[in-house]
């Protein structure tokens, strides 16, 4: 038991990358607990990760439903054990997040260059689809599944031994680019949604050389 | 398999104390949310509140609160639900009842057969 | 708190029969209820959770629906065995609540 009155949720923010979305939000709880709701903007509240006493709740069951969808979540406090409440009128503590759209908000990760070939003076180099949370008839998406075209990749080339950098850009996962033959090159790889106005790009993928295991190499 | 056992039948004065036990057996018992739910004579059921076991936080019905206190004892796997300053109306069977996995977390998959409370002067 | 109304709080039907019992919340409560049949004597069982799905060795004859925020219960046959009181339960909202119960006997 304890007199320390619910403090309310704040700083309530939306963490997602490919669509694995969590809410975080503050404080740290004392002699308190949350349960989140999660709902659209026409849709009913869902209750999830109930009397929990974390700061952060993973909502992607929920979100990835309709990524397409906007959603809001709120946060409520609720008195741990014989805790008094400063609610009025036995009405529970809660604060709103900010809403979120995951198919114009969500992160898009770090890619991986899965291979490369080269053949003479040409050089196909492959970015894996990542496959993502989000569900059609059973199986997961990948990506390129949930974003189309509207997702494109870029590829930084160069020649291992110099600075300067030459771009290519592709609305699949693969490029072809110009080599000079007996050069090594070193490659890396951006996601990119041109169409959006926030989180447009995704970091940089590893950095891939000409030479390592990931290559095939015929004349 | 896994069940709760609870203590037997109490009968009390009012302004008395009770402390029922429940003891899980059959999974892991840190990994369940535990409820206490009860039931006056011929009525329906009323939720008390729940425990988790993993760090003993509570969470208590408005109506309860200060007068129930719910803990935990990790070592026999055993929840206890005490309620205080007892009057008649609190003569009823009470119930723990463990909360479900993740897929039904606040659904009751599993209950004590429950112990008969009686207050009477 | 959230209400939960159920009704009717008894019914009589012959062995054979379909019975449905219905649930309705005070406000929105998404697909958050659970279904529980208690037998006299015994603690309550749960038989469907998150409005429609069956909890593992359940009879199929049992099953659940929502709209919006009306919740059903239907036995598709009634058996001998299913006389009991059946409760619906939200979870949805703290304090958690309880229908008022529905009690089935056989004709």
């Known amino acids: 038991s304890g007199t320390t009155n619910t403090v309310a949720a704040y700083n309530l923010t939306w963490k997602s990358t490919n669509f694995k979305t969590i809410l975080e939000w503050e404080p740290k709880p004392v002699n308190q607990v949350y349960t989140v709701q999660i709902s659209t903007k026409s849709g009913d509240w869902k209750s999830k990760c109930f009397y929990t006493t974390d700061t952060e709740c993973d909502l992607t069951d929920e979100i990835v439903k309709d990524v397409k969808q906007t959603y809001l979540a709120r946060v409520f406090s609720y008195p741990a054990g014989n805790v008094e409440s400063t609610g009025s009128a036995g009405e529970p503590l809660y604060e709103n997040s900010p809403e979120f759209t995951p198919y114009l908000e969500t992160n898009l990760g770090q890619p991986t260059i899965q291979s490369f070939e080269q053949v003479g003076t040409k050089v196909n180099v492959t970015v894996e689809d990542e496959r993502t949370l989000v569900r059609r008839n059973n199986t997961f998406l990948s990506l390129r599944d949930v974003f189309g075209k509207d997702l494109i990749y870029t590829l930084y080339y160069w020649k291992d031994s110099s600075t300067g950098r030459k771009t290519n850009t592709t609305h699949t996962n693969e490029f072809l680019i110009d080599v000079e033959k007996g050069v090594s090159y070193c490659f890396f790889a951006q996601a990119v949604i041109p169409s959006r106005t926030v989180n447009r790009k995704s970091t940089d993928s590893p950095v891939e050389c000409m030479g390592q295991e990931k290559g095939e190499f015929r004349e | 398999q896994v069940q709760l056992v609870q203590s037997g039948a109490e009968v009390k004065k009012p302004g008395a104390s009770v402390k029922v036990s429940c003891k899980a057996s059959g999974y892991t018992f840190a990994n369940y949310y535990m409820h206490w739910v009860r039931q006056a004579p011929g009525q329906g059921l009323e939720w008390m509140g729940i425990i988790n076991p993993s760090g003993g936080i509570t969470v208590y019905a408005q109506k309860f609160q200060g007068r129930v206190t719910m803990t935990r004892d990790t070592s026999t796997s055993t929840v206890y639900m005490e309620l205080s300053s007892l009057r008649s109306e609190d003569t009823a069977v009470y119930y723990c009842?463990?909360?479900?996995?993740?897929?039904?977390?606040?659904?009751?998959?599993?209950w004590g057969q429950g112990t008969m409370v009686t207050v009477s002067s | 708190d959230i209400q939960m109304t159920q009704s009717p709080s008894s019914l009589s039907a012959s062995v054979g029969d379909r019975v449905t019992i219905t649930c309705q919340a005070s406000q929105d409560i998404s697909n958050s209820l659970n279904w529980y049949q208690q037998k006299p004597g015994k603690a309550p069982k749960l038989l469907i959770y998150?409005?429609?799905n069956l909890e593992t060795g359940v009879p199929s004859r049992f099953s659940g629906s929502r709209s919006g925020t009306d919740f059903t219960f239907t036995i598709s046959s009634l058996q001998p065995e299913d006389i009991a009181t059946y409760y619906c339960?939200?979870?949805?909202?703290?304090?958690?609540?309880f229908g008022g119960g529905t009690k089935v006997e056989i004709k």
């Open positions: 339960q939200q979870y949805n909202f703290h304090p958690l609540t």
């Open positions: 998150d409005a429609s």
């Open positions: 009842a463990r909360g479900g996995s993740k897929v039904a977390a606040l659904a009751f998959d599993i």
